[in-house]
């Protein structure tokens, strides 16, 4: 009382930091700093982040919250998790689509667009790896189909059908005639 020296930050508990004259307790995640504390080891005045904004960490200095990102509809992105006061929107791809990074060194914050997954069934192939972080990995031709060029061709259903060597190996009994 009545002194003139500002105290050092030797407050009980953690998360106190000098803000101007005094050591203040910071604001919890999801809150911004309205006004710093007005006495040693005091609580700052903190307010909840308004709608469509967030702060993910405890902080001493943010006087405004960060704006939530909007998922890029042009890139076919969707919100996997909506923005909250403590976390930004998590954008991703809807089921049946995969993330295609727009930069070579891809990290979680890199820009991306969504691509439709390959439908192995439509290509008459086995699904070797399901599509999630990368495109579907299709395997060999389904039963009743054989490799021909880049695709799978249906085994001939009549004796009139031509059946090259690979067809004969896969289609079996069909190549008796």
């Amino acid at each position: 009382q009545g002194g003139t020296r500002s105290p050092r930050c030797d407050c009980a508990g953690d998360f106190h930091k000098k803000i101007g004259l005094f050591c203040c307790r910071g604001c919890p995640a999801g809150h911004y700093l309205k006004a710093p504390c007005t006495e040693p080891c005091g609580n700052s005045t903190c307010l909840v982040c308004p709608q469509d904004t967030f702060l993910a960490w405890e902080n001493h200095h943010n006087s405004e919250c960060a704006r939530c990102q909007a998922c890029d509809e042009q890139a076919s992105q969707v919100a996997l998790e909506n923005c909250s006061a403590v976390a930004d929107t998590r954008c991703g791809c809807k089921p049946g689509w995969f993330v295609e990074c727009q930069v070579s060194q891809c990290v979680s914050s890199s820009p991306f667009y969504c691509q439709p997954c390959l439908d192995c069934g439509a290509l008459h192939r086995h699904t070797r790896l399901l599509c999630s972080r990368r495109d579907t990995d299709c395997g060999t031709c389904l039963p009743g189909f054989y490799e021909h060029g880049d695709g799978c061709v249906s085994c001939p259903t009549s004796t009139l059908g031509s059946c090259p060597e690979r067809c004969a190996a896969v289609c079996g009994w069909r190549q008796m005639f």
């Epitope: 009545g2 500002s6 101007g20 004259l21 007005t38 006495e39 040693p40």
Partner: antibody
Framework: EVQLVESGGGSVQPGGSLRLSCAAS????????MSWVRQAPGKGLEWISY????????YYADSVKGQFTISRDNAKNSLYLQMNSLRAEDTAVYYC?????????WGQGTLVTVSS | DIVMTQSPSSLSASVGDRVTITCQAS??????LSWYQQKPGKAPKLLIN???NLETGVPSRFSGSGSGTDFTFTISSLQPEDIATYYC?????????FGQGTRLEIK
């Protein structure tokens, strides 16, 4: 709109007393630390006292310690400065100012003249 | 107490000039420094806090820089309405102290 309005200034003889008031409006007064700053005629600014938002902590410049008392009434949104044993060198315009260090709003000031 | 030394104490400049005022603290005050403008007969007005943060509504021609003990206040292009006295102020420690002021006038 934030407003700070000082009152209570005037002329007083050396050794006399005055009580300055500062009426605050347009913000949550009880959330802010407040200070008194004075300015002698033709001179610079001198911080003289600070009070925390709750009124629990007060600080004074050495030049007024034991002579001036800062106080506040959050229910009335008011800040006060009780000035005793006034001397000629206390003649100044007295400003109330909002903030815990950096003063973002100031009143228009009230003139205190100490003269026989 | 922390002594704030402002220079120059007065200066004369022309409209459009770049004006620089310096402020030196007698000890390290980090970035806990404000700049104020005071026009005759008026209360001071906060222009910059935390050494370089421009207050809302303050024209962008005003700027501040520095940390530790040496600080600079700049008006990039002097306007007639900038005629005033400018003060630096530290709030790293009590007692809060001001520089002695810099009186700015038009040539």
């Amino acid at each position: 709109e934030v407003q700070l309005v000082e009152s209570g200034g005037g002329s007083v003889q050396p050794g006399g007393s005055l009580r300055l008031s500062c009426a605050a409006s347009g913000f949550t007064f009880s959330s802010y630390g407040m200070s008194w700053v004075r300015q002698a005629p033709g001179k610079g600014l001198e911080w003289i006292s600070y009070i925390s938002s709750s009124g629990g902590h007060t600080y004074y410049a050495d030049s007024v310690k034991g002579q001036f008392t800062i106080s506040r009434d959050n229910a009335k949104n008011s800040l006060y400065l009780q000035m005793n044993s006034l001397r000629a060198e206390d003649t100044a315009v007295y400003y109330c100012a909002r903030g815990s260090g950096s003063f973002d709003y100031w009143g228009q000031g009230t003139l205190v003249t100490v003269s026989s | 107490d922390i002594v704030m030394t402002q220079s120059p104490s007065s200066l004369s400049a022309s409209v459009g000039d770049r004006v620089t005022i310096t402020c030196q603290a007698s000890q390290d005050i980090s970035n806990y420094l404000s700049w104020y403008q005071q026009k005759p007969g008026k209360a001071p007005k906060l222009l910059i806090n935390d050494a370089s943060n421009l207050e809302t509504g303050v024209p962008s021609r005003f700027s501040g820089s520095g940390s530790g003990t040496d600080f600079t206040f700049t008006i990039s292009s002097l306007q007639p309405e900038d005629i005033a006295t400018y003060y630096c102020q530290q709030y790293d420690n009590l007692p809060i102290t001001f520089g002695q002021g810099t009186r700015l006038e038009i040539k």
